[in-house]
Amino acid sequence: IPVIEPSGPELVVKPGETVTLRCVGNGSVEWDGPISPHWTLYSDGPSSVLTTNNATFQNTRTYRCTEPGDPLGGSAAIHLYVKDPARPWNVLAKEVVVFEDQDALLPCLLTDPVLEAGVSLVRLRGRPLLRHTNYSFSPWHGFIIHRAKFIQGQDYQCSALMGGRKVMSISIRLKVQKVIPGPPALTLVPAELVRIRGEAAQIVCSASNIDVDFDVFLQHNTTKLAIPQRSDFHDNRYQKVLTLSLGQVDFQHAGNYSCVASNVQGKHSTSMFFQVVESAYLDLSSEQNLIQEVTVGEGLNLKVMVEAYPGLQGFNWTYLGPFSDHQPEPKLANATTKDTYRHTFTLSLPRLKPSEAGRYSFLARNPGGWRALTFELTLRYPPEVSVIWTSINGSGTLLCAASGYPQPNVTWLQCAGHTDRCDEAQVLQVWVDPHPEVLSQEPFQKVTVQSLLTAETLEHNQTYECRAHNSVGSGSWAFIPISAGARTHPPDE
């Protein structure tokens, strides 16, 4: 580590005196920073000598010497005071620039350490500091304003008490720059816009930034628009606003509009789409199939998407029958607006009853007219089965009626013994009726089919079961003959 002679760490001299500062190291040494012309610098073997024959208050500062070859990078310093009774301050810089919340060093160096007790910092022409200005003083470095704020960007003077009066330094201008966290904040309203040709429209692009140095423009497709900017300052931010006002829109005004703002940190942009149409429109659609099938007792939500301009003047859900004259309860109808021109309307139908099957229509109206979208709701029912013994054309016949939706299919089983239901182990014969007769098939209602099993005599101690099933479930009816007769064969399949 180099060594400075005299040993310091401070040296106090009078103006006009000769000052010699010698720095000695193991290898070659050098003095840091720019050396003012008042000094003579020469090398003497492993030492470097700074000398002046006429010290002035401007020589007041810290002199540092380093040894470039030293792997530890050590240095030695001495602070020189040139104690001028007329000049208590040596100002090293007239302007200091810092970012907000940094410490700002105002480099006014005291030329006489004895004066330290009576120093203070003031604003230009002796005005007091702003409230909450937190500062400290170092005779070697000057005044430090801690965590400088933008508002503290002012002209300052350092004051020292000399013989009962305050002596000021020349002024130091402090510039406190705001820390720009990123590109300006932007808003572009509306987020989308539809207008009929000839209507008025307005698009507003606004940007805000914590300082005034930023630019904003509104672009249509690739054309930068010429719009006079309105400026403002509120909420501690600078605002710049561009308003595109169109008295009568035409098709060439349609397209993509981008609001673009930039500052030293970069660029930020946001876009919207403007659509110009010839006339009002109203479009209804659904992601669901318009023909719906639901099991009785379950619930269903019917959903309609509406795209419209101008806005809707009326809308409602209507039950069109065929079962009753009830109408959907308003509390079961829900409307949500996805955005300005798109809406979703939902009708909730919980725990569906047989009388609620049928057609449900959503109607909407705007200046473009009326539109309707109709759903057809059919309820699914598990089969209900009944069997009777009858005589048809003199032949004994088992008649099975099955009712459900979708249309049930029918299977006959013959099994041993008397039982409520044939299980697989007991089954003796199975007949599938491929084409049962359809007795009734009305829209939104159950389908009723009939299947016949003809037998001249039914065997005693046997059970005959009619089974019907569809996608919802199955149903069955077992028939046990009371008297035995001749064995007969089932009809050919």
């Epitope: 509104l218 249509h220 497709n221 690739t222 054309t223 930068k224 628009l225 010429a226 719009i227 006079p228 900017q229 309105r230 400026s231 308003t243 595109l244 006002s245 008295g247």
Partner: antibody, heavy 118, light 113 residues
Framework: EVQLQQSGPELVKPGASVKISCKAS????????MNWVNQRHGERLEWIGE????????SYNQKFKGKATLTVDKSSSTAYMELRSLTSEDSAVYYC???????????WGPGTTVIVSS | DIVMTQSPSSLTVTAGEKVTMSCKSS????????????LTWYQQKPGQPPKLLIY???TRESGVPDRFTGSGSGTDFTLTISSVQTEDLAVYYC?????????FGTGTKLEIK
């Protein structure tokens, strides 16, 4: 209907000044730049300058700097142009024109005739 | 400044004829941002202010008859009237919208026989 209404004709003496007005109606005055153009006895049109009605910022044709001063009164949606140190060379029809956001002049005033004569 | 030169300075035609007039600029009016030409045509009838006809060199202003067509790019532009009508008697000016100061052409005076 979008309209620009200009003040009447002016007969002024050389060396004098004149201030002509342009009142806008049928649109939001502050959302468009206002421009001024002159035309000397049926010759070509010459752009004088334009103004941002929000803050009074102006751009001038170098030729008219010092000759024309553009001002605005936002409250009455009126733009003004003052011409000073008039000479016979300044005798012309002066038009105000609204500049569309797409750069061209889409609405023009009827013009104000200024005659400089002793 | 951009200098705009129009030719011819005047022309006399019969109603129903096709007319073309030229406008040349001293530097390119092609806007690199949008690849459009910042050139505007105005019509000025006697005793009236100019009226916007065509912008971006070829886009007809709303309400302008389709017999008026603008064409060209860079420094050479043309205004064509496909079938001149008596009400087209006017002076036609081209204008640089590209950069300050906005400059106008010398004008082409259209007269009807």
């Amino acid at each position: 209907e979008v309209q620009l209404q200009q003040s009447g004709p002016e007969l002024v003496k050389p060396g004098a000044s004149v201030k002509i007005s342009c009142k806008a109606s049928g649109y939001t005055f502050s959302n468009y730049y206002m421009n001024w153009v002159n035309q000397r006895h049926g010759e070509r049109l010459e752009w004088i300058g334009e103004m941002n009605p929000n803050n009074g910022d102006s751009s001038y044709n170098q030729k008219f700097k010092g000759k024309a001063t553009l001002t605005v009164d936002k409250s009455s949606s009126t733009a003004y142009m003052e011409l000073r140190s008039l000479t016979s060379e300044d005798s012309a029809v002066y038009y105000c024109a609204r500049r569309s956001p797409w750069w061209f002049f889409d609405v023009w005033g009827p013009g104000t005739t200024v005659i400089v004569s002793s | 400044d951009i200098v705009m030169t129009q030719s011819p300075s005047s022309l006399t035609v019969t109603a129903g004829e096709k007319v073309t007039m030229s406008c040349k600029s001293s530097q390119s009016l092609l806007n690199s941002g949008n690849q459009k030409n910042s050139l505007t045509w105005y019509q000025q009838k006697p005793g009236q202010p100019p009226k916007l006809l065509i912008y971006w060199a070829s886009t007809r202003e709303s309400g302008v008859p389709d017999r008026f067509t603008g064409s060209g790019s860079g420094t050479d532009f043309t205004l064509t009237i496909s079938s001149v009508q008596t009400e087209d008697l006017a002076v036609y000016y081209c204008q640089n919208d590209y950069t300050y100061p906005f400059t106008f052409g010398t004008g082409t005076k259209l007269e009807i026989k």
